[in-house]
């Protein structure tokens, strides 16, 4: 029987260039008569052009919604009603070809062609893109607040903020023909719910979305986005009503940056340089293609690529890479943003070198990618350490902490977190190594204590990169390194001449001179510790709520003992910078550390002194008694303490704590407490110091109060941020 043909709406969006007209500022104002008259003519021309081709039978509707430079560019959309079976045949490319063909056929024609009555359309300037009904609806919702801006070469244009009476606005941006636009977004408020979407075309086409950002992101206070060419659209959707613009937008045209390089690496290990996407740290642009060719000096070496918060993963061939596609020696890998470091190790089997390609497969992009490159020894990729195959990183082996996600760094250990005697593989505790007393059968624990040794898990690395065997040699009053660097930066960790944490006791003035009280509007919120003349360390989760993210809110008190009164030794500071660890993850509490830069340096006194920071190799032995201090609640759910409390806690092996907390304890965490509970940190102690006293009498920062189940509960320990796990970031920031 007869069956009606199913028709579907196919939406197209595009632009065309008119050579015999010029753009004027009047055409940016939709309410102007010039705009109305021009759109009426342009719309007529567009309809006539489409209906002059075999697409005419499918024509449904069209609209010219905007104009731009070039001499005059018209931006439009149109809808064709086409039979479903022909849908794939009428791709944007086919439609564009048909319209261009039509334009070319009439270029030299003397016959009267309706669509050429007023406009001379450039066939080469026609662009047709795929769109959807949803895209047109999104576009129409912004037309009440539509801004067109042309930005010339060498210009940086600050865009006018949105119209707060509108619920959505669109900035249509255009630059010189062969350049690409770079948009800079800076969030200016601590919290908002505004949404901004950037597109690689003139309108909000979902398939050409570059990125969308939402709600005054603290992770990215400044975002720079690159378009693939000279056109871009930014759509704003209103969040909470605000009197002030929560962001500043500026745009500038930039030249295309080549992303191709040939490099020959030197005959040395470690990082030798950096490769990055154009205009890093800007988001890479759609259609980015980078090709890096690296030549390795010898087949003894492999090539290592060290990424920051980005990893490479295998992907099924039919699935596109949404965060960048990589091809390395014909292997296809997909990029993936993660909150961890990662390394890709590429074995070298031929002297021809290695070609690395990076491509943005889809229009959706992300933060620029930067990678450090260097060589590693193929026969011994991680001298003195363990190569974690899961993430390509070298991690300490047999130190009692499963640094590798599969835990293989702690498997097959003869001596875990202890020293292995040469004579008989007896294990002795690390503090007994190089302590002047032989504990191994033939005294191998006391050998090579005055000379350099190969670097390993517990060796201390001196500034000259040589290593010493003695564990924890920092600031013990005896130079162990040839360059004396183990005794540098030692003006720390000494208590002042001093005469409630759950189960604690009141501290005296000067007893914990590094202790900080972080306050908002006169209320103690978190603890912290002074680690340098202008830096206080605390927990990142103290700033979890958007309302707590602004530096202006916080006051830091040092030398304080009592919350309700001041004494002469007490000093206060404003905060000039607040830095959360870039890998901090709220849900898992991983990398729970933040640094506060004080508005002026501290003047050291008996009541105000920094605590010592441990080296990455510093070993805090499980079972060691350490101390936590703070003004937190004296019982679970109770109010904060008026007096600074102190309590001793015992360091717990990672394995035991991990079991208790169902394997939620990461290598950046450390546990302390007792099976019987009672002594523990509590609400208000967060970010405060867990300190351990070295044999020298100096106090080293082992942890920061982070999380735990309740306070002082039996069988549950306190979980602390492990300082040795985040020390490289701390040093990088502070120095």
């Amino acid at each position: 029987g007869y069956k009606a043909e199913v028709m579907v709406s196919q939406v197209y969006s595009g632009s065309l260039r008119v050579l015999n007209r010029h753009f004027s500022q009047d055409l940016t104002r939709r309410e102007s008569s010039a705009f109305r008259s021009e759109t009426a003519k342009a719309q007529k021309m567009l309809k006539e052009l489409i209906t002059s081709t075999r697409l005419g039978t499918y024509y449904n509707s069209s609209s010219v919604y905007s104009f731009g430079e070039g001499p005059l560019t018209c931006f439009f959309w149109f809808i064709l009603q086409i039979p479903e079976h022909r849908r794939l045949m009428l791709s944007p490319e086919v439609v564009q070809a048909l319209l261009v063909e039509e334009l070319l056929s009439t270029v030299n024609s003397s016959a009267a062609v309706p669509y050429r009555a007023e406009y001379e359309v450039d066939p080469e300037g026609l662009v047709i893109l795929e769109a959807s009904v949803k895209d047109i609806a999104a576009l129409n919702s912004t037309l009440g607040c539509y801004r067109y801006s042309y930005v010339g070469q060498g210009q940086v244009l600050r865009l006018k903020g949105p119209d707060h009476l509108a619920s959505s606005c669109l900035w249509h941006l255009q630059g010189p023909k062969d350049l690409m636009l770079k948009l800079r977004l800076e969030w200016t408020l601590a919290e908002c719910r505004d949404r901004l979407a950037m597109y690689d075309v003139a309108g909000p086409l979902e398939k050409r979305l570059i990125t969308s950002v939402y709600g005054c992101s603290r992770q990215e206070p400044v975002v720079e986005v690159l378009a693939s060419g000279a056109i871009m659209a930014v759509v704003w959707k209103k969040g909470l009503h605000s009197y002030y613009d929560p962001f500043v937008l500026s745009v500038q045209p930039v030249v295309f940056q080549a992303c191709e390089v040939n490099l020959t690496l030197d005959n040395r290990l470690d990082s030798q340089g950096v490769l990055s996407t154009p205009y890093f740290p800007s988001y890479y642009s759609p259609q980015t293609h980078c090709s890096w060719h690296l030549t390795v000096p010898s087949l003894d070496y492999g090539l290592a690529l060290w990424f920051d918060a980005y990893a490479l993963r295998r992907q099924k061939y039919d699935l596109p890479c949404t965060q960048g596609q990589w091809t390395i020696q014909n292997r296809r890998l997909c990029g993936l943003r993660i909150l961890q470091p990662y390394a890709e190790r590429i074995p070298v089997v031929a002297t021809a070198g290695i070609t690395i390609n990076f491509t943005s497969q889809i229009s959706l992009t992300g933060p620029g990618v930067r990678v450090h490159y260097g060589l590693y020894n193929q026969s011994d990729p991680c001298p003195g350490e363990f190569l974690c195959s899961v993430n390509g990183l070298c991690v300490p082996a047999c130190d009692g902490v499963k640094d590798c996600p599969n835990g293989l760094d702690e498997r097959n250990c003869v001596c875990r977190a202890t020293f292995q005697c040469k004579e008989d593989s007896t294990c002795i505790s690390l503090p007994k190594v190089c302590d002047g007393q032989p504990d191994c059968l033939n005294g191998s624990d006391e050998e090579q204590c005055q000379e350099g040794v190969p670097c390993g898990t517990f060796t201390f690395q001196c500034e000259d990169r040589s290593c010493v065997k003695k564990p924890n040699p920092q600031c013990d009053g005896r130079p162990d390194c040839r360059d004396g660097s183990d005794e540098e930066h030692c003006d720390c960790g000494l208590q002042g001449p001093s005469s409630r944490i759950v189960g604690g006791a009141v501290s005296s003035e000067g007893e914990w001179p590094w202790q900080a009280s972080l306050q908002v509007r006169g209320r103690h919120i978190c603890g912290g510790a002074l680690i340098a003349d202008r830096w206080v360390i605390t927990a990142a989760h103290c700033f979890q709520e958007d309302s707590m993210a602004s530096t202006v809110l916080w006051t830091v008190f040092l030398g304080k003992v009592w919350q309700n009164s001041r004494w002469p030794g007490e000093v206060s500071f404003k905060v000039s910078r607040l830095l959360l660890h870039p890998y901090h993850e709220e849900d898992s509490h991983d990398y729970d550390v933040a640094l506060l830069q004080l508005d002026h340096p501290v003047v050291r006194s008996a009541a105000v002194r920094p605590v010592c920071l441990p080296a990455r190799s510093h070993f805090f032995e499980p079972g060691l008694h350490c101390w936590i201090t703070g003004w937190g609640a004296l019982r679970e759910g109770g109010p904060i303490s008026n007096a600074l409390q102190k309590v001793d806690v015992q360091l717990i092996p990672q394995d035991l704590c991990s079991e208790v907390y169902r394997y939620q304890v990461t290598p950046r965490m450390l546990c302390a407490g007792y099976r019987k509970g009672k002594k523990d940190a509590c609400q208000g102690d967060s970010g405060g110091p867990l300190v351990c006293k070295a044999l020298s009498g100096r106090w080293f920062l082992a942890g920061l109060v982070s999380w735990g189940l309740g306070c002082g509960r039996p069988n549950y320990f306190g979980v602390y941020t492990r300082i040795t796990g985040v020390i490289s970031w701390i040093q990088q920031v502070v120095t």
Partner: antibody, heavy 123, light 107 residues
Framework: EVQLVESGGGLVKPGRSLRLSCTGS????????MSWFRQAPGKGLEWVCF??????????DYAPSVKGRFTISRDDSISIAYLQMNSLTTEDTAVYYC??????????????WGQGTQVTVSS | DIQMTQSPSSLSASLGDSITITCQAS??????LIWYQHKPGKAPKLLIF???NLETGVPSRFSGSGSGTDFTFTISSLQPEDYATYYC?????????FGGGTKVDIK
């Protein structure tokens, strides 16, 4: 019920060796540190040595008076701690007690002790 | 080594009496102090740890206090089963050291 039973004591000549055993039951032996103490006739208690559990490295510590002569070891598979005593002197005559350390309650806090085994060093 | 001085070395008391034993450390040991009860031929028994924490199952008539170098152990109402020798022990560092003991007998 937690129980510790010492065995292996007896009379031994000076300069000779003796091995004491301490068998634990009623608890997961491998989770606990083990220690030996002694009490010489008419004297107070004296700590001798200590061995940590595996999670704490299984390392050992000794009182200066026995270091180099005594060795503490453990076999978690059969829940036994040993004290190997070499080069014995008359000063080592005492009742030897083994005890359990629940390190998670506190380092060097010994919550259960055995009844003791007598070691007499005499020619 | 840390020396622990316990006093008195012996005392006689009647049932229901309250008795106090003191223990002094030769250096600051914060609160790292244990009190044990020891009866002849029996295993020593842990009573108090961390200077003042009562071990599970120990009657509340036993109590401890102090911090730093001076510590006190009290039995508030002596019972027949309390006649024994009591020892303090520091666990601030190795070697672990004991007080000389206090023998409590019936008056």
């Amino acid at each position: 019920e937690v129980q510790l039973v010492e065995s292996g004591g007896g009379l031994v000549k000076p300069g000779r060796s003796l091995r004491l055993s301490c068998t634990g039951s009623g608890f997961t032996f491998g989770d606990f540190g083990m220690s030996w103490f002694r009490q010489a006739p008419g004297k107070g208690l004296e700590w001798v040595c200590f061995i940590r559990s595996k999670p704490y490295g299984g390392t050992t510590d000794y009182a200066p008076s026995v270091k180099g002569r005594f060795t503490i070891s453990r076999d978690d598979s059969i829940s036994i701690a040993y004290l190997q005593m070499n080069s014995l002197t008359t000063e080592d005559t005492a009742v030897y007690y083994c005890s359990r350390n629940d390190i998670l309650t506190g380092y060097y806090i010994f919550d259960y002790w055995g009844q003791g085994t007598q070691v007499t060093v005499s020619s | 080594d840390i020396q622990m001085t316990q006093s008195p070395s012996s005392l006689s008391a009647s049932l229901g009496d309250s008795i106090t034993i003191t223990c002094q450390a030769s250096q600051d040991i914060t609160n790292y102090l244990i009190w044990y009860q020891h009866k002849p031929g029996k295993a020593p028994k842990l009573l108090i740890f961390d200077a003042s924490n009562l071990e599970t199952g120990v009657p509340s008539r036993f109590s401890g206090s102090g911090s730093g170098t001076d510590f006190t152990f009290t039995i508030s109402s002596l019972q027949p089963e309390d006649y024994a020798t009591y020892y303090c022990q520091q666990y601030y560092n190795l070697p672990l050291t004991f007080g000389g003991g206090t023998k409590v007998d019936i008056k």
